[in-house]
Interface confidence: low
């Protein structure tokens, strides 16, 4: 998957006071970013 800028996606989607740096340190790929935010928002 993928497409677009994952950095832009992260900056527009930050929740729970997490920082861009901390998220990038725990997610290894663009696909991880996609799934992380999908599940985060989907389980609200």
């Amino acid at each position: 998957g993928g497409g677009g800028s994952k950095h832009k996606c992260v900056q527009n989607s930050l929740v729970n006071n997490e920082t861009l740096e901390s998220i990038m340190n725990t997610l290894e790929s663009e696909e991880d970013f996609r799934k992380y935010f999908y599940y985060l928002e989907g389980s609200k």
Partner: antibody, heavy 122, light 113 residues
Framework: QVQLVQSGGGLVQPGGSLRLSCAAS????????MSWVRQAPGKGLEWVSA????????YYADSVRGRFTISRDNSKNTLYLQMNSLRAEDTAIYYC???????????????WGRGTLVTVSS | DIQMTQSPDSLAVSLGERATINCKSS????????????LAWYQQKPGQPPKLLIY???TRESGVPDRFSGSGSGTDFTLTISSLQAEDVAVYYC?????????FGQGTKVEIK
Amino acid sequence: QVQLVQSGGGLVQPGGSLRLSCAASGFTFSNYAMSWVRQAPGKGLEWVSAISGSGDNTYYADSVRGRFTISRDNSKNTLYLQMNSLRAEDTAIYYCAKDPHSSRWPGFFDLWGRGTLVTVSS
Amino acid sequence: DIQMTQSPDSLAVSLGERATINCKSSQSVLYSSNNQNYLAWYQQKPGQPPKLLIYWASTRESGVPDRFSGSGSGTDFTLTISSLQAEDVAVYYCQQYYSTPYTFGQGTKVEIK
């Protein structure tokens, strides 16, 4: 009423163009990722393209990349699929489909349009 | 791309009996970070669009009868109709949404024996 109303199908010659529309109602359209899924006559389902709620992110199947363009107008609650350089193998019923979560990323589909038939033939 | 393979292609079951459809993915659709399987099941009746039955491999969509259940993890999944009803005659599809391009199984046609 929560629904997706499709329009824009029809008969087109190979190499031609067509634009499909999908008008959404009953939910906050801009909150949801949307996809197009097609089904050739008598065949199974094939995901074609997807777009995030904001329209910032788009995704395509290899079979249509470079020929089809997905877009949305959130002010009109409408999803589009611009189809260029059409081929006989693009003949199918095209469905628009909504993702069930308020997410920027598409995944699975809880609301479907009724479908519109696109026939590519000379 | 992740290939999805369903078995059998068609299935004839007596009313009130159990129907079991299998779906196998060419690679795991289990995402370890959240322990979720990115797999959905749909029902499609003739002349109608598909209808979502199951997502996250085992979560039943609202309004779907409880005779429909999903199970499995990783690469092997099952849709079970515990007691087949006449209105369940349809084609059933699995779909992975682990990664784009999202892919569907070829479909399993369920009929009454």
